[in-house]
C-alpha cells in the first residue's frame, strides 16, 4: 500500500494507493486505484512480466547457508523458506536453489522450484 503526500492545490493531503491490477492475465498494463477521503482515482500502471518479478517480488524466501560442493554435479545448493508472498501469489513453502561451485564464474542462480501452480 503506497501513500503519497499531495501538496499542490489539492484538498487531499494523503492518497492511499492499492495494488497494480493488470487489465488481463497476471502482468502488463493495468490500473492502480487511489483513495483520499471520499475521492477515488484510477491511474495507469504496469506489472512487469519478467522472470525476476515472478520469482523475486511475488515470493520472498529466507535462505540457509550454501551447502558443500557436490563433486559429481559441480554445484552447491541451499534451501529457502517462504518469508512473504504477494497476496495472490501461489508460492512454494520451500525452494531449493543451486549454483556452480566455482566462485570465480559469475552465473545466475538457477531455481529448481519457484511459484507453484495448483
Amino acid at each position: 500500500k503506497k501513500k503519497e503526500k499531495v501538496k499542490k492545490g489539492s484538498e487531499c493531503s494523503e492518497w492511499t494507493w492499492g495494488p497494480c491490477t493488470p487489465s488481463s492475465k497476471d502482468c502488463g498494463m493495468g490500473f492502480r486505484e487511489g483513495t483520499c477521503g471520499a475521492q477515488t482515482q484510477r491511474v495507469h500502471c504496469k506489472v512487469p512480466c519478467n522472470w525476476k518479478k515472478e520469482f523475486g517480488a511475488d515470493c520472498k524466501y529466507k535462505f540457509e547457508s550454501w551447502g558443500a560442493c557436490d563433486g559429481s554435479t559441480g554445484t552447491k545448493a541451499r534451501q529457502g523458506t517462504l518469508k512473504k508472498a504477494r497476496y495472490n501469489a501461489q508460492c512454494q513453502e520451500t525452494i531449493r536453489v543451486t549454483k556452480p561451485c566455482t566462485s570465480k564464474t559469475k552465473s545466475k542462480t538457477k531455481a529448481k522450484k519457484g511459484k507453484g501452480k495448483d
Partner: antibody, heavy 117, light 107 residues
C-alpha cells in the same frame, strides 16, 4: 495445518477500546497474511484489514482506518486487533484468518465484542 | 471498491438436487474470487479459491467457474450438511470485499 485461537468474548461501554488476540500454532506464523473480518449479528462478512507478520505491512479497509489498529508479536506467534472509540454498531463477531494463496486459509473461532451502555 | 452481487438471496432445494449459486463482480477481477460456506455459530470455511481451484478436504461435489465478472459455485448433488450460507469474496484489489451471501435452505 495452522490453528488460530482467539481471545474470549468482551463486553465494553461506548467510547472504550478493546484488543482482540489471535494466537497461531502449527505452520510458520510469519509467512502468511493475517486477515481480520467482522460479522455483525445476522449480517454478512466485512473485511477490516490485514497484516503480514514478517514486516508488519498493513493494509486497512479505509472504512476502519480510524477504528482498527493491527499488530503482531512474532515471538508469541500472535496477531492483535485493537478497536477504539467503540460504538453499538461495532457489536459483532471478529475473526482472524491466516491466508496463503497456495493452500487456502485457516480461521479463528471468532471473538464476540458487545458494546453496550 | 469492487461490489459483489450474489444471487439468488435464498435457494430452496431438496437433498440430491443440483445447486447453482451466482456471484457477479462490478468489474473484471480475473480469477481472484473465492467461495466460503458458513453455518450458524461457526467461522466461514473456504470451499473454492481462485474461481475454480479445489481445496484439500472439501468434497468433490463443490466446483467453481470463472474468470472475469461472472462466477458460479455448483454443488452437483446437495447433501443435508450443505444447507448453509455461501459467500463469495474477491482479492483482486483492496479493500477485499464479500458478496451479500446466498442462503441454501431445505425445500
Amino acid at each position: 495445518q495452522v490453528q488460530l485461537v482467539q481471545s474470549g468474548a468482551e463486553v465494553k461501554k461506548p467510547g472504550a477500546s478493546v484488543k482482540v488476540s489471535c494466537k497461531a500454532s502449527g505452520q510458520s506464523f510469519s509467512s502468511y497474511w493475517m486477515n481480520w473480518v467482522r460479522q455483525a449479528p445476522g449480517q454478512g462478512l466485512e473485511w477490516i484489514g490485514m497484516i503480514h507478520p514478517s514486516d508488519s505491512e498493513t493494509i486497512l479497509n479505509q472504512k476502519f482506518k480510524d477504528k482498527a489498529t493491527l499488530t503482531v508479536d512474532i515471538s508469541t506467534s500472535t496477531a492483535y486487533m485493537e478497536l477504539s472509540s467503540l460504538r453499538s454498531e461495532d457489536t459483532a463477531v471478529y475473526y482472524c484468518s491466516s491466508w496463503s494463496a497456495k493452500r487456502g486459509d485457516f480461521w479463528g473461532q471468532g471473538t464476540l465484542v458487545t458494546v453496550s451502555s | 471498491e469492487i461490489v459483489l452481487t450474489q444471487s439468488p438471496a435464498t435457494l430452496s432445494l431438496s437433498p440430491g438436487e443440483r445447486a447453482t449459486l451466482s456471484c457477479r463482480a462490478s468489474e473484471s477481477i480475473s480469477n481472484n474470487l473465492h467461495w466460503y460456506q458458513q453455518k450458524p455459530g461457526q467461522a466461514p470455511r473456504l470451499l473454492i479459491k481462485y474461481a475454480s481451484q479445489s481445496i484439500s478436504g472439501i468434497p468433490a461435489r463443490f466446483s467453481g467457474s470463472g474468470p472475469g465478472t461472472d462466477f458460479t459455485l455448483t454443488i452437483s448433488s446437495v447433501e443435508p450438511e450443505d444447507f448453509a450460507v455461501y459467500y463469495c469474496q474477491q482479492s483482486n484489489s483492496w479493500p477485499l470485499t464479500f458478496g451479500g451471501g446466498t442462503k441454501l435452505e431445505i425445500k
